[in-house]
Interface confidence: low
């Protein structure tokens, strides 16, 4: 029998799968790869065109508890000159990321994957008008 | 682990650590927001910094398809619409957290897996080395 | 989930101008818009902008009249509304979604603020 997998394509399902509950999946926090270190260029937030700020979010029932996010500096962005040119756009990229919920209900405690939209950083765009008809 | 306030009201039992292993509802929060870059916004053309977006897809791992940036310059474009070698495009990185199928091929056990993407490209000013 | 209080509404006669304001708190959003629903009437699309401040878009009925923006935090979006008609009159609503796509589509938005009231009469 063919079973529905997250994500919408199918699977055989080995024999050798754990038993899970109805409407629930089996989920190791162990993460693989956590020592895993970003090799990006050295200070590349405040070296752009469109620099950004970090900022840490903190919640102890997120896990992991801490994401940082970018937030850009400018409107505009930084020419030559190293002053704001506001005919150009200093905008933010995003990217999604899984994280685990913990949820209270009482005294009994459940677990919901969530999706968060992390802004990473930021870069430097001609704008745009959109009419819409 | 993650420490968190107990409520003081319930039983000393429960772990004030997140558990190494959870039974997670097979629904995700959120899990309807833009997935596709090339949809939720053309900034990867629009930017000085232009990227082409490469499709890296996994049916083990949730979610299946990731995009992946590829910057097309080593420079960025200036307002005349050239490359700029004076300055350089450079991939911003970010590290994210998937679902990796464990074991294999089971629809219902996953283990959390952090991949590092690029997400985009931004334009920055290079670092120029001297040599004594 | 977000926090949404507009400002600014009132009475003003044809050929007048009023500046509308939405406060927004909590999560972000990738496009904040505003919408307006006139007595009897369907809740209709105004403007939007996106979370980044850089792409507007504008209904028909008022491009060259309304210009939306935002500060600079994204925080506080404005409705500058010039030119006012009777036919401007209506219940504007500020609300936020997610995703660029058919931001035209009022369905589309998650989280409403109030409404202020904006009357057109001489």
């Known amino acids: 029998r063919k079973i529905p997998k997250v994500g919408h394509t199918f699977f055989q399902k080995p024999e050798s799968c754990p038993p899970v509950p109805g409407g629930s999946m089996k989920l190791d926090i162990g993460i693989i790869n956590e020592n895993q270190r970003v090799s990006m260029s050295r200070n590349i937030e405040s070296r752009s065109t469109s620099p950004w700020n970090y900022t840490v979010t903190w919640d102890p029932n997120r896990y992991p508890s801490e994401v940082v996010q970018a937030q850009c500096r400018n409107l505009g962005c930084i020419n030559a000159q190293g002053k704001e040119d506001i005919s150009m756009n200093s905008v933010p990229i995003q990217q999604e990321t899984l994280v685990v919920r913990r949820k209270h209900q009482g005294c009994s405690v459940s677990f919901q994957l969530e999706k968060v939209l992390v802004t990473v950083g930021c870069t430097c765009v001609t704008p745009v008008i959109h009419h819409v008809q | 682990g993650i420490t968190i306030p107990r409520n003081p009201g319930c039983p000393n039992s429960e772990d004030k650590n997140f558990p190494r292993t959870v039974m997670v509802n097979l629904n995700i929060h959120n899990r309807n927001t833009n997935t596709n870059p090339k949809r939720s916004s053309d900034y990867y053309n629009r930017s000085t910094s232009p990227w082409n977006l490469h499709r890296n897809e996994d049916p083990e791992r949730y979610p299946s398809v990731i995009w992946e940036a590829k910057c097309r310059h080593l420079g960025c474009i200036n307002a005349d619409g050239n490359v700029d070698y004076h300055m350089n495009s450079v991939p911003i990185q970010q590290e994210i957290l998937v679902l990796r199928r464990e074991p294999p091929h089971c629809p219902n056990s996953f283990r959390l897996e952090k991949i590092l993407v690029s997400v985009g490209c931004t334009c920055v000013t290079p670092i120029v080395h001297h040599v004594a | 989930e977000v926090q949404l209080v507009e400002s600014g509404g009132g009475l003003v006669q044809p050929g007048g101008s009023l500046r509308l304001s939405c406060a927004a708190s909590?999560?972000?959003?990738?496009?904040m818009g505003w919408l307006r629903q006139a007595p009897g009437k369907e809740r209709e699309f105004v403007a939007a902008?996106?979370?980044?401040?850089?792409?507007?878009y504008y209904a028909d009925s008022v491009k060259g009249r309304f210009t939306i923006s935002r500060d600079n935090s994204g925080i506080t979006m404005y409705l500058q509304m010039n030119s006012l008609r009777p036919e401007d009159t209506a219940v504007y609503y500020c609300?936020?979604?997610?995703?660029?796509?058919?931001?035209?589509?009022?369905?589309?938005?998650?989280?409403w603020g109030q409404g202020t009231l904006v009357t057109v009469s001489s």
């Open positions: 902008i996106s979370g980044s401040g850089d792409d507007t």
């Open positions: 609300a936020t979604r997610r995703g660029l796509y058919y931001v035209w589509d009022s369905n589309d938005y998650e989280n």
């Open positions: 909590g999560r972000t959003y990738d496009a």
